[in-house]
């Protein structure tokens, strides 16, 4: 029977800068029942506070609701593990909510084959930002990435869409069924999970020069911009 091993706070995430959750890994339990508590203070504060909510985030977590989430304020936190034989503390973790945002995936992904009479056919992809994100306040800039592949292919083709919420793709294999997904990331923070896949059947008469892709930017009032494969690769952020 021993004191508990050192716990580790391994992850903090916020879906929207309004709430956040941190998770820890327990160390060894020393063969005894072990209690865990997370304490924190905000930068510049001389008081220590205990975790407000150990339930919402699941086991070994601390959830900070709206009333405990301050932007532009660093939280300094540690986890204390205690059993009958003694205590051990995690290292202090410094958390700034601005840098731990991981949004939910984009919503309402819609994919359509467009075949205008006077122009080449294209695949039109449209989506909405996740609901928890308020883009109107200007706090957030969301960047989007699209991936697509023929159903039976192993490799995904990835396109960086910037801040647009719609995208046009011309170079596709006719007659193939494609999977399309989109994800998003704030200017500082982490990529969301990919949205659920949407399937689209490309018609057999769909043809376009593989060298080029057409992108439509909503904020250009419908004006279209032709950019090369090389430019697209340059715009792609991993």
């Amino acid at each position: 029977q021993l004191p508990p091993g050192k716990p580790e706070i391994f992850k903090c995430r916020s879906p929207n800068k309004e709430t956040f959750t941190c998770w820890w890994r327990p160390g060894t339990d020393g063969g005894l029942p072990t209690n865990y508590s997370l304490t924190y203070h905000r930068e510049g504060e001389t008081l220590m506070h205990e975790c407000p909510d150990y339930i919402t985030g699941g086991p070994n977590s601390c959830h900070f609701g709206k009333q405990y989430t301050s932007m532009w304020r660093t939280y300094i936190m540690m986890v204390n593990a205690t059993n009958q034989m003694g205590s051990s503390f995690s290292d202090e973790l410094y958390v700034d909510v601005t840098y731990i945002v991981q949004p939910d995936p984009p919503l309402e992904l819609a994919v359509e084959v467009k075949q205008p009479e006077d122009r080449k056919p294209y695949l039109w992809i449209k989506w909405s930002p996740p609901t928890l994100i308020d883009l109107k306040t200007g706090w957030f800039t969301l960047l989007y990435e699209i991936r697509l592949k023929p159903e039976k292919a192993a490799e995904w083709e990835i396109h960086f869409a910037g801040q647009q919420t719609e995208f046009k793709i011309l170079s596709l294999h006719p007659g193939q069924k494609y999977l399309v997904q989109v994800r998003c990331k704030p200017d500082h923070g982490y990529w969301s999970a990919w949205s659920p896949a949407t399937f689209i059947q490309i018609p057999s008469d769909f043809t376009m020069n593989d060298e080029q892709k057409l992108i439509s930017e909503e904020d250009l009032g419908g004006e279209q911009k032709l950019i090369s494969e090389e430019d697209l690769h340059h715009h792609h952020h991993h």
Epitope: E45, L47, Q67
Partner: antibody, heavy 121, light 107 residues
């Protein structure tokens, strides 16, 4: 309208006890840290006690530690202050005050009208 | 405990004049944790400024706060009749404490 209303004040002898109550309305009570602040006759403001919205650790001024107990009932939008072993220097107008955020140690943006406590033999 | 000292104790000015009130802390305070209140005679205190310089809801722009470290100030650009009152600074980096107050009265 956002408001706090205190009750329970009165005249008590030294060594006696009183229980102050505060009821909040017009806002989500359980989103805010809550506090008691007092003001002696003709004196300045003194923070007495407070705690975070979830009823976590309680915090007290040195002058009342061990004698006063703060508690809250979020379901009833209520804050309480149990005052024991009262002294003459506890004579004051007691305000129930709301913190701007979930922390008790924040700026106090809503104040009740106060309830008067007089400790006198 | 963080002790706050306010100066002057009393400030005698006329309506329309500019008032500058000072608050000094016994130790360095992060500017996120300093507030100012106004208490008119016979009334409850009202939050004016929080986080050293952010105006509370409904507070007119004649009130402004500034400072860092141990020295903070509240400036009232043009005194209105309702500003003849007592002003308190408060820190909340630790257990909250208030300064003793500055009384602004009519000259």
């Amino acid at each position: 309208e956002v408001q706090l209303v205190e009750s329970g004040g009165g005249v008590v002898r030294p060594g006696g006890s009183l229980r102050l109550s505060c009821v909040g309305s017009g806002f989500s009570f359980d989103d805010h840290g809550m506090n008691w602040v007092r003001q002696g006759p003709g004196k300045g403001l003194e923070w007495v006690s407070g705690f975070n919205w979830n009823g976590g650790s309680t915090n007290y001024a040195e002058s009342v530690k061990g004698r006063f107990t703060i508690s809250r009932d979020n379901a009833r939008n209520s804050l309480f202050l149990q005052m024991n072993s009262l002294r003459a220097e506890d004579t004051a107008l007691y305000y129930c005050v709301r913190g701007r955020s979930g922390w008790f140690n924040d700026a106090f943006d809503v104040w009740g009208p106060g309830t008067m406590v007089t400790v006198s033999s | 405990e963080i002790v706050l000292t306010q100066s002057p104790g009393t400030l005698s000015l006329s309506p329309g004049e500019r008032a500058t009130l000072s608050c000094r802390a016994s130790q360095t305070i992060n500017s996120n944790y300093l507030a100012w209140y106004r208490q008119k005679p016979g009334q409850t205190p009202r939050l004016l400024i929080y986080g050293t310089s952010s105006r509370a809801t409904g507070i007119p722009d004649r009130f402004s706060g500034s400072g860092s470290g141990t020295d903070f100030s509240l400036t009232i650009s043009r005194l209105e009749p309702e500003d003849f009152a007592v002003f308190y600074c408060q820190q909340y980096a630790g257990l909250p404490t208030f300064g003793p107050g500055t009384k602004v009265d009519i000259k």
